[in-house]
């Protein structure tokens, strides 16, 4: 069982291989001195079927360096950077992992690209690994709180409560979605 | 950090074979690549060959080919590596290492596995 | 097979002083080399990465350069801990290491 050819890269180059290529394989891709590389650089020639090779993903691309390029902070609910840290440069890489209780989805590294924006594919999602989730937290009188979203929230994350100027926070100021599905704590008020 | 332990020592007669286990903990273990890289006494590292079990294929130098045969049980977490004919020059410490992502470097090696092979 | 070879085979350095290895390729590897250190009785710590690229938890003290053929791996002001073999490999085309450099104290 081989792969054919590596899928080819503009203003870079392939690392050395031979034919046929051996399921197994690793090839490497790099760009020349004034461009950067979005994705993955390593491709892996695996099987799907036992009959026939393949490469594993897409190849990556090389990208004109451009030096005003910043990347914002990429958040992921549910899960933690592992690699990469601010500020994010054209071609800067961050990595991903899920807190405790929650699974990935889509692919654990974004690169930073020429247009500000992470890729070359989406964000990864943290997915609860529990069915159950905690209602909505209402908004509070006089504040504010970090979830907007009317939606429910998997266990594992929390709201962070604050109050407008002027205002005092009574109660829990961060509040935690359990895995029961049930709120650490009853929301705060804000009072004068 | 993933920990790789091998099995204990082992001597072995000329012609004999040899069977080598490296238990993984931490990380996932069906995702990474286990290699097989061998020292002799007073010398050098030498890769053998390597499996990433979720693949279930291993790749050998061509040094080895025929004579090496490399596993992994993805139910418990090890990697095998098993050496036959064996011969007095195959006396040496055996050590899996783990890669990541098939980056191609080793950020997690085995304690080392020494096999004597004498008559 | 891509032949790596490493160079002084022994380099004894003073304490404090900066120390200098040297490791070439056969065929260009690009920045595919990694630095290994190994302690006798021990397993090999990874140090470098990617020719350049410092391992996780490895000092500031450790540097890499170089790509195509040619790579150094300098050690800016020896420890006493630092006294061990050094090996380098290559990931361009399947894995090799070179036959190692002894570092030892002077």
């Known amino acids: 069982i081989s792969c054919g050819s590596p899928p080819p890269i503009l203003n870079g180059r392939i690392s050395y291989y031979s034919t046929p290529i051996a399921v197994g394989t690793v090839i490497r891709y790099s760009c020349s001195g004034t461009f950067r590389l979005i994705g993955e650089k390593s491709l892996l020639c695996i099987t799907k079927d036992k009959v026939d090779g393949t490469w594993d993903k897409p190849a990556p691309k090389c990208e004109y360096f451009n030096k005003y390029s910043s990347c914002p902070e990429p958040i992921v609910p549910g899960g933690y950077k592992i690699r990469g840290s601010t500020p994010y440069r054209h071609g800067d890489s961050v990595t991903f992992a899920c807190k405790t209780n929650f699974s990935m989805n889509g692919n654990k590294s974004v690169w930073c690209q020429a247009n500000n924006m992470w890729g070359p594919t989406r964000l990864p999602t943290c997915v609860s690994v529990f069915p159950l989730e905690c209602p909505a937290l209402p908004m509070i009188h006089n504040g504010h709180h970090t979830s907007e979203n009317v939606g429910s929230i998997a266990p594992g994350l929390s709201v962070t409560y604050s109050c407008e100027s002027g205002y005092l926070l009574v109660g829990e100021k961060i509040i935690n979605c359990l895995s029961s599905g049930k709120w650490s704590a009853v929301p705060p008020t804000c009072e004068e | 950090q993933v920990q790789l332990v091998q099995s204990g020592a082992e001597v072995k007669k000329p012609g004999s074979s040899v069977k080598v286990s490296c238990k993984a903990s931490?990380?996932?273990?069906?995702?990474?690549?286990i290699s097989w890289v061998r020292q002799a006494p007073g010398q050098g590292l030498e890769w053998m060959g390597r499996i990433i079990p979720i693949l279930g294929i291993a790749n050998y130098a061509q040094k080895f080919q025929g004579r090496v045969t490399i596993t992994a049980d993805k139910s418990t977490s090890t990697a095998y590596m098993e050496l036959s004919s064996l011969r007095s020059e195959d006396t040496a410490v055996y050590y899996c290492?783990?890669?990541?992502?098939?980056?191609?470097?080793?950020?997690?090696w085995g304690q080392g596995t020494l096999v004597t092979v004498s008559s | 097979e891509i032949v790596m070879t490493q160079s002084p085979a022994t380099l004894s350095v003073s304490p404090g002083e900066r120390a200098t290895l040297s490791c070439r390729a056969g065929?260009?590897?690009?920045?595919?080399l990694a630095w290994y250190q190994q302690k006798p009785g021990q397993a090999p710590r990874l140090l470098i990465y990617?020719?350049?690229t410092r391992a996780t938890g490895i000092p500031a003290r450790f540097s890499g350069s170089g790509s195509g053929t040619e790579f150094t791996l300098t050690i800016s002001s020896l420890q006493s801990e630092d006294f061990a073999v050094y090996y380098c490999q290559q990931y361009e085309y399947w894995y090799t290491f070179g036959q190692g450099t002894k570092l030892e104290i002077k």
């Open positions: 990617d020719a350049s």
């Open positions: 931490g990380g996932t273990f069906s995702t990474y690549a």
């Open positions: 065929q260009s590897i690009n920045s595919y």
């Open positions: 290492a783990r890669e990541d992502d098939s980056s191609g470097y080793y950020q997690d």
